[in-house]
Amino acid sequence: SIPWNLERITPPRYRADEYQPPDGGSLVEVYLLDTSIQSDHREIEGRVMVTDFENVPEEDGTRFHRQASKCDSHGTHLAGVVSGRDAGVAKGASMRSLRVLNCQGKGTVSGTLIGLEFIRKSQLVQPVGPLVVLLPLAGGYSRVLNAACQRLARAGVVLVTAAGNFRDDACLYSPASAPEVITVGATNAQDQPVTLGTLGTNFGRCVDLFAPGEDIIGASSDCSTCFVSQSGTSQAAAHVAGIAAMMLSAEPELTLAELRQRLIHFSAKDVINEAWFPEDQRVLTPNLVAALPPSTHGAGWQLFCRTVWSAHSGPTRMATAVARCAPDEELLSCSSFSRSGKRRGERMEAQGGKLVCRAHNAFGGEGVYAIARCCLLPQANCSVHTAPPAEASMGTRVHCHQQGHVLTGCSSHWEVEDLGTHKPPVLRPRGQPNQCVGHREASIHASCCHAPGLECKVKEHGIPAPQEQVTVACEEGWTLTGCSALPGTSHVLGAYAVDNTCVVRSRDVSTTGSTSEGAVTAVAICCRSRHLAQASQELQGSTSGSGLNDIFEAQKIEWHEHHHHHH
Amino acid sequence: QEDEDGDYEELVLALRSEEDGLAEAPEHGTTATFHRCAKDPWRLPGTYVVVLKEETHLSQSERTARRLQAQAARRGYLTKILHVFHGLLPGFLVKMSGDLLELALKLPHVDYIEEDSSVFAQ
């Protein structure tokens, strides 16, 4: 039978037939920065080119005792997971290995930097197709390592890294904390976070998604036909590097932002038991397990969005938190969240020619998070319209008045420490869907966008009785771009998007006042792009044989339980 | 994923512009910073990545590295330039005593300096 990890990342449509793409990833080159590898292993022979790059910390002179097989173990296994003939994800991908980790699996930030520089120079000397760089390593937070990753990503390289095995916040480690890198946590066959006593997968807002990372069968450096199981976030990252290679091979023009959005979109949602994560990290950690797309056809028309959480603001009264989208993404809405409920809302503001989402802490608050909804919207022209506090009893309102602009998100920000319980109307006037409504003492910010074929609608779900969580989801074919709460009273902790669902959290029901005061409405703005759908249909008509489904259907490959059939 | 995050240590060493009478003193008001790994056992003191400002050319990187060596030698310190970066980030990797950090932070074009640290297979 197919190994559990390959089954898990295979779309359901293909599972019954055990399809494995025969040459997935053939247009892509994957660089592996790791230990030395056994390049003559049958799994990877002819697929991995060992470069002459080596930069590792000195090993003890007495290390001649250490067998080469152990020195090669980590890297050989990962190369097999990415592109192995039998147990690999992207069986057609070619790889290049750089040795930056010694026999103990230890390296240095400087050695890794020089390795990344080597890749950039190789790319400049001999430009090839899409490049994926796999960094199955982690150290403490490093400004310089993150900066180097950022530069390489901006040069068009896709970087995939391990979240780390420290059972800790991934933001405390590098390159896991680099925003441009795709950071991968590890899950097991039960879709639960990988744990081993005091250690386990890292988590938190710096993780992009999870992937299989426990009991992963792959090439063993014991012998050229040997296999072994290994576990860790390196194995998880190798799965995502393989999936990325498959996607890029099917669509070589994908940008990093597009690839990341697709990885998120095609992931299995809400399968991880969040109880394993520390309570304060649950909301920040993506509940996503990576999977291959069923096909690339039909993906192009989607309006892809993801949620980006800021770092915590800290508890000082004037503290703020900022969430940013990637350079190629559009900020379509901005919300905020505070566990204590003490916050002063959020606003979208320009910073360095780009919109960012800023959340404001309040006096006595333990701090806030800013939550950006970042979307791929080609040819978009977005602006923020602001209405100052209205003072009138009807509350503050703002709408998109420019021709062809649609409302994608609403934010509200207030200077007063406590908005109190003055309740603005929950229902907005009929025939005016394009407006944001907020508390009369708050300034309201509307995100208004013009993009070809973009249409949006507002969806609300109100609960009259107090409840800790109110949700509203966009229906099939629509994408959540905005998520906010009505009213903006102090018992609302905040609002945030989880996949296509808008979640509004309120204070524990026992601490809220009367029923009327406890009423909360979750407001979702759902959008779709007719333009992208049309473009995708045209593309489908003009191209054939380039999608992942064609690769999938080209050949059926059996998983061989016993690997000594090579003899 | 934020850039300035975690219990990461940043030591800001103030510039004393009069020292050494540098011909190319850093622009007014900018302070180069020193960074090191917050996880003590992973620190590798004695090796430092000197990161220069974004638009610094390779020739300027090499010149800055030589200047550091010369100024260190005048103070009786031996330094070794292990690598000059270009292509991704401008800068250089230097093996030197931590006593020279204050001096290095005052060099022209320096954006920040980071002490080397360990990374591990995951």
């Epitope: 190994p3 003890d60 007495t62 290390r63 005792h65 250490r66 067998q67 152990k70 173990s73 980590h74 103990q104 699996g105 230890k106 095995n165 081993l196 250690l199 009991d215 069968i217 063993s220 014991d222 012998c223 036909t225 040997c226 296999f227 072994v228 199981s229 290994q230 576990s231 860790g232 390196s234 339980e561 016993h562 690997h563 000594h564 | 591990f120 297979a121 995951q122």
Partner: antibody, heavy 121, light 107 residues
Framework: QVQLVQSGAEVKKPGASVKVSCKAS????????IHWVRQAPGQGLEWMGY????????KFNQKFKDRVTMTRDTSISTAYMELSRLRSDDTAVYYC??????????????WGQGTTVTVSS | DIVMTQSPSSLSASVGDRVTITCKAS??????VDWYQQKPGKSPKLLIY???NRYTGVPSRFSGSGSGTDFTLTISSLQPEDFATYFC?????????FGGGTKVEIK
């Protein structure tokens, strides 16, 4: 659950051979190396070697190299350790253990219950 | 072969005592040391992997430290079920080698 079940106690004469079996269950047998460790009465633990069940690859402690054979039968998820030319100082409890690799850390996470081998004339 | 020298070979302690067992390697084994507990007539059980990481289900009173050639297993507050023999083992190079063991007895 994951377990290793070993064959029963053996009494052998000097010069004879003994073959101890170790049946794995609860996991993919071909995914983990099986190591053999022995413990003489009142003594410490001594590593003998291992087999990678995905192939026939073995690695031995030089001390036992000429006398030990390690094999496996994947159809019944069983590993075997045969020690020949037995001497009285081979009297010991023989354990099989599964080696696990997590990150770059290696350890024996599952042990068999042990097989007592007594060598006596 | 790398020799792992464990000390003491035995010790007597009372419930609630803090117990420290040391292991010295004849050469640098980095952090590549595991610790096992064995009770009479039973198989060894993994306590600590890679010098300092507590294995699943192992009580927090057990901790490990060290790197290079010197390693320590500490039981912060000895419990009745902790009376057993403890072994260190290096996996840095073949052949794997174990320490001679430390028997922890009731005082």
């Amino acid at each position: 659950q994951v377990q290793l079940v070993q064959s029963g106690a053996e009494v052998k004469k000097p010069g004879a051979s003994v073959k101890v079996s170790c049946k794995a269950s609860g996991y993919t047998f071909t995914g983990y190396t099986i190591h053999w460790v022995r413990q003489a009465p009142g003594q410490g633990l001594e590593w003998m070697g291992y087999i990678n069940p995905s192939s026939t690859y073995t690695k031995f402690n030089q001390k036992f190299k000429d006398r030990v054979t390690m094999t496996r039968d994947t159809s019944i998820s069983t590993a075997y350790m045969e020690l020949s030319r037995l001497r009285s100082d081979d009297t010991a409890v023989y354990y099989c253990a599964r080696e696990r690799i997590y990150s770059n850390y290696w350890f024996f996470d599952v042990w068999g219950q042990g097989t007592t081998v007594t060598v006596s004339s | 072969d790398i020799v792992m020298t464990q000390s003491p070979s035995s010790l007597s302690a009372s419930v609630g005592d803090r117990v420290t067992i040391t292991c010295k390697a004849s050469q640098n084994v980095y952090w590549e040391v595991d610790w096992y507990q064995q009770k009479p007539g039973k198989s060894p059980k993994l306590l600590i992997y890679s010098a300092s990481n507590r294995y699943t289900g192992v009580p927090s009173r057990f901790s490990g430290s060290g790197s290079g050639t010197d390693f320590t297993l500490t039981i912060s507050s000895l419990q009745p079920e902790d009376f057993a023999t403890y072994f260190c083992q290096q996996y840095s190079s073949y052949p794997y080698t174990f320490g001679g063991g430390t028997k922890v007895e009731i005082k």
